[in-house]
């Protein structure tokens, strides 16, 4: 999916008002210095591509974040403010319903959510030069 035409300001507002808080809640009890940011993004569409990948694609050691509150809100924001995004999720939703229902917080998941926090922060500062 190409995130170029999303309403970035409305997605940013949703992040600042609610998604950011859910990410913090998920990470509660973890030191902010515990994980190094290894995933980066260069512009807003690229950031959303990386955010979608880390949020919804299972990785080794972190089977699924998709049922977490921050993920549900991310999905809603993309569906509402990214043209044509919702139709790409019709089959993905069916697959998610069949997926394992239990929510397990592993160290790998914490690391992944820490990366997500970095990507979202970068998304909110699009004019900063890439380090």
């Amino acid at each position: 999916y190409d995130f170029t035409n999303c309403d970035f300001e409305k997605i940013k507002a949703a992040y600042l008002s609610t998604i950011s808080k859910d990410l913090i809640t998920y990470m509660s009890g973890t030191k902010s210095t515990e994980f190094n940011n290894t995933v980066s993004c260069s512009n807003r569409p690229h950031c959303l591509t990386e955010i979608q990948s880390l949020t919804f694609n299972p990785t080794a050691g972190c089977a699924s974040l998709a049922k977490e509150m921050f993920a549900m809100k991310t999905k809603a924001a993309l569906a509402i403010w990214c043209p044509g995004y919702s139709e790409t999720q019709i089959n993905a939703t069916q697959a998610m319903k069949k997926a394992r229902k239990s929510k397990v917080t592993t160290n790998k998941c914490l690391e992944q959510v820490s990366q997500l926090q970095g990507l979202w922060r970068r998304f909110n500062r699009p004019l900063l030069k890439q380090q």
Epitope: K10, A14, A76, A77, W81, G84, E87, I90
Partner: antibody
């Protein structure tokens, strides 16, 4: 079963405001956005805006920006649409309709409609 | 804003006949089109979503097709209860918009 029950008909004077309610039941309120659509007599359907409980935010059709305010009370699963500075052209049936925001993504259930008549 | 134009405005047919309703978008919207039926004094009812997906409880004589800018709703054999107004809607991008409507009336 899913039900959206709207408030009763209203007769309003030009320049005044109207607030229409839509009480939802039979599903998890925060899993769906609540959209408002209006239909003038003998005309087609016009999307006004939406409230997304999951994100606690609204979005509007620019044609109604500044005049329409869409809110919700999550504790009672009730959505509201307030339209101000009413004029005769606002005489219409106003519908609420739910739409999944993390699945389905379509207006699959509608309220019965509320007729708002604006007349001096 | 994406404009949806429906044609014809009115379709006069007899029960048992096939109805073909068209919806054209002002720009490509992939498959983000849904079809609704509305009878006088009633709220719209969802018939087809995302161009061709069927809804449980909707008779299988209703089918949808198309992608990009051209979409079609087909009613294979009209029943008496099918005479109504039909609207297409796009949810590709905000503001969501509806088509102008096609009235299917008894000939």
């Amino acid at each position: 079963q899913v039900q959206l029950v709207q408030s009763g008909p209203e007769v309003k004077k030009p320049g005044s405001s109207v607030k229409v309610s839509c009480k939802a039941s039979g599903y998890i309120f925060t899993d769906y956005a609540m959209h408002w659509v209006r239909q003038r007599p003998g005309q087609g359907l016009e999307w006004m805006g939406t409230f997304i409980p999951l994100l606690d935010t609204s979005d509007y059709n620019q044609n109604f920006k500044g005049r329409a305010t869409i809110t919700a009370d999550k504790s009672t699963s009730t959505a509201y649409m307030e339209l101000s500075s009413l004029r005769s052209e606002d005489t219409a049936v106003y519908y609420c309709a739910r739409m999944g925001v993390t699945h389905s993504y379509v207006m699959d259930a509608w309220g019965q409609g509320t007729l708002v008549t604006v007349s001096s | 804003e994406i404009v949806l134009t429906q044609s014809p405005g009115t379709l006069s047919l007899s029960p048992g006949e096939r109805a073909t309703l068209s919806c054209r978008a002002s720009q490509p919207i992939s498959i983000s089109v849904h079809w609704y039926q509305q009878k006088p004094g009633e709220a719209p009812r969802l018939l087809i979503y995302f161009a061709s997906q069927s809804i449980s409880g909707i008779p299988d004589r209703f089918s949808g097709s198309g992608s990009g800018t051209d979409f079609t709703l087909t009613i294979s054999r009209l029943e008496s209860e099918d005479f109504a107004v039909y609207y297409c809607q796009q949810t590709f991008s905000l503001p969501y918009t509806f088509g102008t409507g096609t009235k299917v009336e008894i000939k």
